[in-house]
Amino acid sequence: MKVLQEPTCVSDYMSISTCEWKMNGPTNCSTELRLLYQLVFLLSEAHTCIPENNGGAGCVCHLLMDDVVSADNYTLDLWAGQQLLWKGSFKPSEHVKPRAPGNLTVHTNVSDTLLLTWSNPYPPDNYLYNHLTYAVNIWSENDPADFRIYNVTYLEPSLRIAASTLKSGISYRARVRAWARCYNTTWSEWSPSTKWHNSYREPFEQH
């Protein structure tokens, strides 16, 4: 039994880090493998993660972590019974994938303006709370070509757009994701999408 693709890990910079790897053949990850992880400092405890299958030869492990700080560094040991298959380390602050934003809501009652709001996925004391920027994806359910991305580079989790920038009388969906420039993070997963019917008053044309 050998590791084909070494574990790569990402942290939500709060409570979970997720590690994925591939074995050289079909593996029952939960019965055959264990991933041990330990914070590097004197007297720290070793924790054991039981991996789950992620495709035939793929494994994934969710490592529970206390509040992450930038100095945290973990040793990782992948075991198959008594055999050490791989040894590595992981610094959560250097491999961050933010949590997805939540509670995306489209407010259509503001005169001819769409107000999209969502929730920052971090509590105020978390470092990422004040460092997230967002991308909002809006698309038409009727027309696959009607697909747009709005970059929200300010801190407020909201976006205003004129309803008239979208077609009237049809349904749209929106979703949002986050990233943090300060930690050069990857993008979060997209939030669940929300749907609304776009309608607005056409401007009166004078001839």
Epitope: S15, I16, E52, H62, L64, V68, D125
Partner: antibody, heavy 115, light 107 residues
Framework: QVQLVESGGGLVQPGGSLRLSCVAS????????MNWVRQAPGKGLEWVSY????????YYADSVKGRFTISRDNAKNSLYLQMNSLRDEDTAVYYC????????WGQGTLVTVSS | DIQMTQSPSAMSASVGDRVTITCRAS??????LAWFQQKPGKVPTRLIY???SLQSGVPSRFSGSGSGTEFTLTISSLQPEDFATYYC?????????FGQGTKVEIK
């Protein structure tokens, strides 16, 4: 091995105060965020409060906000819950529980609020 | 605040039965969900975290699934020591909230 031992519970009248303590051993307390969780007699679990190891930030359940204060003394390996303006509905066994996500619990201390 | 609704609140089952307990969150919590077991007079112990990750030392007959708002704890073949109360917990945001519990009793 990890051990959490609560103390300070007892009988108190409505409107009174109590201070609960939780002494930790078997791990580096200063590196761990901590929680208080309670359970009223015959009822379910209710999260009460949290204190971060990283920032010292604190969070509370709405039911205790403004009345309870969580704190810690890393030099004494101790977690505290100062409970003021106690009500009948605060009667419960109070547990301290360690992060991440309540991986270790103390045995609990009973707080009874009654006249 | 996020509400966690567990069902059923109580159930009777026999040794060897397959038992399923569900937990519904009032809003999306991704996979930030854990399951705990509590026996009478004892302290709760964590069975599952991150919705589907089995806690080390917990028998493999316990499994968790779900994401978003719908979650399930399954005991594939109920053993005598599994008669207890089970709680789900969301830790996606503060305040953290538990489900009201599911008591699994002997039929």
């Amino acid at each position: 091995q990890v051990q959490l031992v609560e103390s300070g519970g007892g009988l108190v009248q409505p409107g009174g105060s109590l201070r609960l303590s939780c002494v930790a051993s078997g791990f580096t307390f200063s590196h761990s965020s901590m929680n208080w969780v309670r359970q009223a007699p015959g009822k379910g679990l209710e999260w009460v409060s949290y204190i971060s190891r990283a920032t010292g930030a604190v969070y509370y359940a709405d039911s205790v906000k403004g009345r309870f204060t969580i704190s810690r003394d890393n030099a004494k390996n101790s977690l505290y819950l100062q409970m003021n303006s106690l009500r009948d509905e605060d009667t419960a066994v109070y547990y301290c529980a360690r992060e991440p996500v309540f991986d270790y619990w103390g045995q609990g201390t009973l707080v009874t609020v009654s006249s | 605040d996020i509400q966690m609704t567990q069902s059923p609140s109580a159930m009777s089952a026999s040794v060897g039965d397959r038992v399923t307990i569900t937990c519904r969150a009032s809003q999306d919590i991704s996979n930030y969900l854990a399951w705990f077991q509590q026996k009478p007079g004892k302290v709760p112990t964590r069975l599952i975290y991150a919705a589907s990750s089995l806690q080390s030392g917990v028998p493999s007959r316990f499994s968790g699934s779900g994401s978003g708002t719908e979650f399930t704890l399954t005991i594939s073949s109920l053993q005598p020591e599994d008669f207890a109360t089970y709680y789900c917990l969301q830790w996606s945001s503060y305040p953290r909230t538990f489900g009201q519990g599911t008591k699994v009793e002997i039929k």
